[in-house]
Interface confidence: medium
């Protein structure tokens, strides 16, 4: 018997589909063999040969079996207030996320197009809702009996110290000063410490998501920046 | 497991009617196109008809065409064989056949029904 | 006559190596379409034995090989046991038919 030869291309039978990692080329109207990750195709298939692939040159990558003529272009390098969390392969695009401090304001399919500083609220205002990757901080005002005294995206609203005998009384962005030696806290409702932002990554344990297989084809149009919220300060 | 059963076979005089079917059962039938195939004693095989998953499509051989119709019911998971005007040469055990869906090929087959033309 | 030719008959001694030929036309194996090869014992359904030339579907002892080139196919069966004595057929789609057509059969006997 003589040597296998290579199944594809062929001609797919109706009611049959061609098997996974082919195509149908129209022109040759055969079931024909993709290029894998990393490789673009460089002759497409007739009736009597199969596709040939090629590797893809720097700074450019295909992420999935594919049979397109050209690799796709990497992004462009990440920006200052970017760090890369993966670099750019000839198997996978380069992806940018926003440093510590700073959230997407306008992402893309893999990572972020557009990074924001977080709001700081000023004192007076404590922290409502962290921020997170892809959400900015909001403040809110301190309610009577607890203040914030620190321009901060972490810091919320902390109860008064209560006094035996007050000697300045606390506002919303000072606390009670006391004259007696034994100061107490009090156990405001609801005054919990809210953890940091994810965005931070001061406390960042989980593993980040696997990148998405599908090819960036859609166009996000760009956003206005968003009014600054009350008591938050002006970067 | 994926399972075909034919029924509907029988003795029948020339030039008259049968209706066969194929219940099946243990895989999406609606992925899968559906095929008869024949065989008349002592001889080979012989294709008789084809569907398309979805019921659009039909094929015929040129020795049934206009005499049987091929069809299927999706939400009852069974296949159609209309035979009309029937012949002594149509005598044969009719197996029902899932095409597979890549690269072709019949994939699985009942256990087949006898069809017997004859005055 | 069938579109598909095949060798009305085959034999061989256990332990050895037999091939069934099926040869086509520009419209069926010519056209890019595959063969697929079918076991049938006696008094049963035959079942699938090969599929898009050297495809075997799980259960199908390595035993048995596919090939095909041009208008020509062939199925290999090594080590050849009793229990393989049964008809064998070829298949194909013909395009100029717009319908599958089948090889007449070879019936393979293990002397």
């Known amino acids: 018997l003589p040597a296998q030869v290579a199944f594809t291309p062929y001609a797919p039978e109706p009611g049959s589909t061609c098997r996974l990692r082919e195509y149908y080329d129209q022109t040759a109207q055969m079931c024909c063999s993709k290029c894998s990750p990393g490789q673009h195709a460089k002759v497409f298939c007739t009736k009597t040969s199969d596709t040939v692939c090629d590797s893809c040159e720097d700074s450019t990558y295909t992420q999935l079996w594919n049979w397109v003529p050209e690799c796709l272009s990497c992004g462009s390098r990440c920006s200052s207030d970017q760090v890369e969390t993966q670099a750019c392969t000839r198997e996978q695009n380069r992806i940018c996320t926003c440093r510590p401090g700073w959230y997407c304001a306008l992402s893309k399919q893999e990572g972020c197009r557009l990074c924001a500083p977080l709001r700081k609220c000023r004192p007076g205002f404590g922290v409502a809702r962290p921020g997170t990757e892809t959400s900015d901080v909001v403040c809110k005002p301190c309610a009577p009996g607890t203040f914030s005294n620190t321009t901060s995206s972490t810091d919320i609203c902390r109860p008064h110290q209560i006094c035996n005998v007050v000697a300045i009384p606390g506002n919303a962005s000072m606390d009670a000063v006391c004259t007696s030696t034994s100061p107490t806290r009090s156990m405001a409702p609801g005054a919990v410490h809210l953890p940091q932002p994810v965005s931070t990554r001061s406390q960042h344990t989980q593993p980040t998501p696997e990148p998405s297989t599908a090819p960036s084809t859609s166009f996000l149009l760009p956003m206005g920046p968003s009014p600054p919220a009350e008591g938050s300060t002006g970067d | 497991q994926v399972q075909l059963l034919e029924s509907g076979g029988g003795l029948v005089q020339p030039g008259g009617s049968l209706r066969l079917s194929c219940a099946a059962s243990?895989?999406?039938?609606?992925?899968?196109?559906m095929t008869w195939v024949r065989q008349a004693p002592g001889k080979g095989l012989e294709w008789v008809s084809g569907?398309?998953?979805?019921?659009?499509?039909?094929f015929y051989a040129d020795s049934v065409k206009g005499r049987f119709t091929i069809s299927r019911d999706n939400s009852k998971n069974t296949l159609y064989l209309q035979m009309n005007s029937l012949r002594a040469e149509d005598t044969a055990v009719y197996y029902c056949?899932?095409?597979?869906?890549?690269?072709?090929?019949?994939?699985?087959w009942g256990q087949g029904t006898l069809v017997t033309v004859s005055s | 006559q069938s579109v598909l030719t095949q060798p009305p008959s085959v034999s061989g001694a256990p332990g050895q190596r037999v091939t069934i030929s099926c040869t086509g036309s520009?419209?069926?194996?010519?056209?890019?379409?595959?063969v697929h090869w079918y076991q049938q014992l006696p008094g049963t359904a035959p079942k699938l034995l090969i599929h898009?030339?050297?495809n075997r579907p799980s259960g199908v002892p390595d035993r048995f090989s596919g090939f095909k080139s041009g208008t020509s196919a062939s199925l290999a069966i090594t080590g050849l046991q009793a229990e393989d004595e049964a008809d064998y057929y070829c298949?194909?789609?013909?395009?100029?038919?717009?319908?599958?057509?089948f090889g007449g059969g070879t019936k393979l006997t293990v002397l």
């Open positions: 056949a899932r095409q597979s869906q890549y690269v072709g090929g019949f994939d699985y």
């Open positions: 243990g895989f999406s039938f609606t992925s899968y196109a």
């Open positions: 569907i398309s998953g979805d019921g659009a499509a039909t």
């Open positions: 520009s419209s069926n194996f010519g056209a890019g379409y595959g």
């Open positions: 898009g030339n050297t």
């Open positions: 298949q194909s789609y013909d395009s100029s038919l717009s319908g599958w057509v």
